[in-house]
């Protein structure tokens, strides 16, 4: 067992040309943190496989803005070491990944504005207990400069953290068959320590707190015998008739390994692959932390720091489920109205609106009246966001500001004459038709076709038009 | 890094079709709103199209509605522009494009393809 | 629509010369605006986003400023490799609308 240390020495623009864009601003003023990932390995995994080696995120750093017309400096950091435990034995070969996030705090809308600025990956040789190793990588623009160490934790020692070391019982030497620890020469290799509870005549280990059963026991603990016959044959009981030719139950047989696991056998025993949440001998232990990196697709797992307590994953735009497993479309839900596109920038979603509508969601429909008086009388009407005046009589145009001649569309019907009046228009009647636009003919018998003329008005008379 | 390239153009007679691709490669394609621009001969930039990432959605300028029609196949990575009923006035360079709005999300490459030119002529 | 009205429509000027190009928004359009370079038979070149952010590349020289309906490029110190038209682009809404172009010509 023992910690992998990442220690971030500077983040920013890296040398040449093209220095890049600060990636806060006034306007959107964020803190930078970052994520290690691990794998075992010199692997040339995608960024998405699991972190087998473990995981860990920083805390978040100093909050920045940036300065107008400033170049994007070196941005300030988290404080701290970013540390990864590992339980089992340092590989010695391993992949990383170092992803450098920015979280926004601005207000935005849906969900976390978090987005991912840099990620940089690579493959290293490590011994465990050696010096701080020194780095430098670069993603796009920018670079990144870091240092890293894989250390032991007492009582392991060595360079894959296996050896075990405890104080010397007698003040001379060691006890027999184990050697002085280097260098820490005044304490002694101890033997291994296999699980708790494994059998001591029928289980061994190889690794601290493992329990490998010896051919014919199972369980756990090596405590369940495979077999109840003394048949020589390795895979078990004899028949009374045939010898040992009935096969007895192999180490898989009935699959040992729980939730789910594969079983496979080995030379001596058998051995459990398990799903994702589960680990231990039979996969019987369940419990998923960050360390274990659940969360896909650059997913930031928070909480989750010992297995009794829950991870959440914090999922990236376009990503969701309970891992980030699931790729999705923000803007499927159709957060924009009245036709807007909608345009997930990542940290937010912007709706672009179509002519006439305006608003975060495009939900306003322009008042396109407002601020625009009709002139000469007229009056404004709002309609799909264009305005239209209506005009008083004798004035036309976009804004009443025209003046019309109301006479220009032959309003008088039948060959009436149309005079120009100061509130509209005057139409003067043909024989045989009267109306305001000559529209109705007189009867030959002096009847008209109205009910009545209005008093004061003969038939043939001018009729104004109001 | 970004790239962007155009093809499909050529001359064609009054009234008739063409259609214009783009394909695009160095950056999540699906996850972008794409426009189409052009350039008459001489003049002005003019913008003709845009389709939503998941090409849902279309916006399409007045000059060109219900003759043009943008599509995008997310699986090939690639951007369309179907052109019909073209007329002389259509004549000019089509750049397809990343939409501004990702300007400060994308940083290598081209925003712009290299454009390739349309000739409506009889 | 939201009509872009950029001036000077072309403008004469010497190297080491500081330009200012303007962009009149008929209506507000909040930092939603896009400045590019084109030469001759070129592709437009992105110069700046946001209206103020210098797009990574782009010499310290070009600056861009303004926002709501008045907006300006800059050139502090104009070189022989910036002799060119400028265009702005609004992209707050549909329709996407672009200036009509200046071009800065050699003195």
């Known amino acids: 067992a023992g910690v992998f240390e990442l220690q971030i020495h500077s983040f920013g623009p890296g040398p040449g040309p093209g220095a890049p864009r600060s990636p806060c601003s006034a306007r959107l003023p964020c803190r930078l943190f970052f994520r290690v990932c691990l794998k075992p390995g010199l692997s040339e995994e995608a960024a998405e496989s699991p972190c087998a080696l473990g995981a860990a995120l920083s805390a978040r750093g100093p909050v920045y803005t940036e300065q107008p017309g400033a170049p994007a400096p070196d941005l300030p950091l988290p404080d701290g070491l970013l540390q990864v435990p590992f339980r089992d034995a340092w590989p010695g070969t391993f992949s990383f990944i170092i992803e450098t996030w920015r979280e926004e705090l601005g207000d935005q809308i849906g969900g976390p504005a978090w987005s991912l600025l840099a990620r940089v990956a690579g493959r290293r040789r490590l011994a465990a207990g050696g010096p701080w190793a020194r780095d430098i990588q670069r993603a796009g623009a920018w670079e990144l400069r870091f240092s890293y160490r894989a250390r032991c934790e007492p009582p392991a020692v060595g360079t894959a953290c296996t050896r075990l070391c405890r104080p010397r019982s007698a003040p001379s030497r060691c006890g027999p068959g184990l050697r002085p620890c280097a260098p820490l020469e005044d304490e002694c290799e101890a033997p291994l320590v296999c699980r708790a509870g494994c059998s001591p005549e029928h289980g061994f280990c190889e690794q601290p707190g493992e329990c490998r059963c010896l051919e014919g026991w199972t369980g756990p603990l090596c405590t369940v015998p495979v077999s109840t016959s003394s048949c020589l044959s390795p895979r078990g009981p004899s028949s009374a008739t045939t010898g040992c030719l009935v096969p007895g139950p192999g180490p898989c047989d009935g699959n040992p390994c729980a939730n789910g696991g594969s079983c496979s056998e080995t030379p001596r025993s058998f051995e459990c692959t398990c799903p994702r949440g589960f680990y231990g001998l039979r996969c019987e232990v369940s419990g998923v932390t960050c360390a274990d990196g659940p969360c896909f697709n650059g997913g930031l797992c928070v909480g989750g720091a010992d297995p009794d307590s829950a991870y959440i994953c914090h999922c990236p735009p376009g990503f969701q489920g309970s891992n980030c497993e699931k790729r999705v479309d923000r803007c499927s839900l159709q957060p924009c109205r009245n036709g807007g596109l909608c345009l997930d920038l990542g940290h937010a979603l912007r709706c672009r609106c179509r002519a006439g509508f305006a608003g975060p969601r495009c939900e306003h429909d322009l008042d396109d009246c407002a601020g625009r008086a009709c002139a000469n009388g007229g009056t404004c009407v709002e309609g799909g966001g264009a305005h239209r005046c209506s005009c008083a009589l004798g004035f036309g145009g976009r804004d009443c500001r025209e003046r019309a001649d109301p006479c220009a569309a032959r309003p008088c019907a039948h060959g009436g004459r149309c005079y120009a009046h100061f509130s509209g228009l005057v139409c003067a009647c043909a024989p045989g038709y009267m109306g305001a636009r000559c529209e109705f003919p007189v009867h030959p018998d002096g009847a008209s076709a109205l009910p009545a003329a209005p008093p004061g008005l003969r038939p043939g008379d001018p009729q104004r038009y109001l | 890094e970004v790239q962007l390239l155009e093809s499909g153009g050529g001359l064609v007679q009054p009234g008739g079709s063409l259609r214009l691709s783009c394909a695009a490669s160095?950056?999540?394609?699906?996850?972008?709103?794409m426009n189409w621009v052009r350039q008459a001969p001489g003049k002005g930039l003019e913008w003709v199209s845009t389709?939503?990432?998941?090409?849902?959605?279309?916006y399409y300028a007045d000059s060109v509605k219900g003759r043009f029609t943008i599509s995008r196949d997310n699986s090939k990575n690639t951007l369309y522009l179907q052109m019909n009923s073209l007329r002389a006035e259509d004549t000019a360079v089509f750049y397809c494009a990343i939409d501004p709005e990702y300007y400060d999300i994308l940083t290598g490459g081209d925003y712009w393809g290299q454009g390739t030119l349309v000739t409506v002529s009889s | 629509d939201i009509q872009m009205t950029q001036s000077p429509s072309a403008m004469s000027a010497s190297v080491g010369d500081r330009v200012t190009i303007t962009c009149r928004a008929s209506q507000g359009i909040s930092n939603y605006l896009a400045w590019f370079q084109q030469k001759p038979g070129k592709v437009p070149k992105r110069l700046i986003y946001a209206a103020s952010s210098l797009q990574s590349g782009v010499p310290s020289r070009f600056s861009g400023s303004g926002s709501g309906t008045e907006f300006t490029l800059t050139i502090s110190s104009l070189q022989p490799e910036d002799f060119a038209t400028y265009f702005c682009l609004q992209h707050d809404s549909f329709p996407l609308t672009f200036g009509g172009g200046t071009k800065v010509e050699i003195k």
């Open positions: 160095g950056f999540t394609f699906s996850s972008y709103a």
């Open positions: 389709i939503s990432g998941s090409g849902g959605s279309t």
